[in-house]
Amino acid sequence: IIDGAPCARGSHPWQVALLSGNQLHCGGVLVNERWVLTAAHCKMNEYTVHLGSDTLGDRRAQRIKASKSFRHPGYSTQTHVNDLMLVKLNSQARLSSMVKKVRLPSRCEPPGTTCTVSGWGTTTSPDVTFPSDLMCVDVKLISPQDCTKVYKDLLENSMLCAGIPDSKKNACNGDSGGPLVCRGTLQGLVSWGTFPCGQPNDPGVYTQVCKFTKWINDTMKKHR
């Protein structure tokens, strides 16, 4: 997260980290006791999922292995359209004050809405500084028309843009798959942006979760 600050302790109990061994790979969100939602470009063969603490490496955190993941069938490694994936935990997460399910959206929020993006990704770019504490930054949803002015044909229908004019505030590497939460509901998953991260007027691009609630629910049912 670029130009952010540590999240208020326990304010993101649905935030998870996907680890490869002990190394941060991506962010994600807990949908229910068995399922984590993240970005399709975060696909690995096996995951260790960190839940229940804002601090990576916290011994009090839950760590659960996951071996099965289901990319959206329409994901493209070229255009990055449909960049979302469900990861099935090998054992159930224990819900608590620090481990809660995210609220999936019942509607798509409009441009101008203030949202929070969070993650343990690098806080500097191109030189990297990985924080141990979960970082947050507030950004505003940007209309597809305005975002297309920046990204032209790279922007697809189910992509959502967010940023602050003339500001560095943005996601970065390691934040992928993590949540963009607006008015208490999950509206986006960190997908991509320009490099170095945090270039003013280059919005962050997110998978627009409100377009995929049916696929999310259907996939969890199908692979119960």
Epitope: Q23, N173, V190, V205
Partner: antibody, heavy 127, light 108 residues
């Protein structure tokens, strides 16, 4: 300003191992989120990618050379290295090291262009 | 592997000419294409990244376009220092990273 400099023997015997080092100055190989790349160019021919290594020391190799190639990083010396085993005359080329600049973050991070290059070093394979 | 085919392999042009070089990928690579210039005895130099973005410090007479499988590098008004060989390169998410065969721009 970042600079890259290749070094290593200019002559290698057939069946031996070619070893080259790229020294990075003006930037830190251990803290910058770039790819570090080896490319070669046989005399009078085009460019061929050998392989790359990233910030996490993950390596990516050209399948046609994979069984013979090792790329590694020495962060204490701000260097990355190439080893190519069992060389033949076909491995005679100018060898370049370069920095791969990602085209984006997240889903666009694994795509890159080489924005800084060493001047190249000529390696001849001959007995 | 994705094959990158450049055309023409060589061309002769005069100072001030508009020059166009094309690069075709054997399958779609979205906008993940870069262009390089190489002068004899020198290392390649990045001109264009992501199909159409001009690398910092590169003169604006160079431009790139295209998406999917067909790409173009255009030099709007050829200068004496532009006589060189030009290569396209497909970004390496689709390994291996591959270059086109090159286009040599010579003085007419």
């Amino acid at each position: 300003q970042l600079q890259l400099q290749e070094s290593g023997p200019g002559l290698v015997k057939p069946s031996e191992t070619l070893s080259l080092t790229c020294t990075v100055s003006g930037g830190s190989i251990s803290s910058d989120d770039y790819y570090w790349v080896w490319i070669r160019q046989p005399p009078g021919k085009g460019l061929e990618w050998i392989g790359s290594i990233d910030y996490f020391a993950s390596t990516y190799y050209n399948p046609s050379l994979k069984s013979r190639v090792t790329i590694s990083v020495d962060t204490s010396k701000n260097q990355f290295s190439l080893k190519l085993s069992s060389v033949t005359a076909a491995d005679t080329a100018v060898y370049y090291c370069a920095r791969g600049r990602p085209l984006g973050y997240g889903a666009r991070h694994d795509y890159y262009g080489m924005d800084v290059w060493g001047q190249g070093t000529t390696v001849t394979v001959s007995s | 592997d994705i094959q990158m085919t450049q055309s023409p392999s060589s061309l002769s042009a005069s100072v001030g000419d508009r020059v166009t070089i094309t690069c075709r990928a054997s399958q779609s690579i979205s906008s993940y294409l870069n262009w390089y210039q190489q002068k004899p005895g020198k290392a390649p130099k990045l001109l264009i990244y992501s199909a159409s973005s001009l690398q910092s410090g590169v003169p604006s007479r160079f431009s790139g376009s295209g998406s999917g499988t067909d790409f173009t590098l255009t030099i709007s008004s050829l200068q004496p220092e532009d006589f060189a060989t030009y290569y396209c390169q497909q970004s390496p998410y689709f390994p291996p990273l591959t270059f086109g065969g090159g286009t040599k721009v010579e003085i007419k």
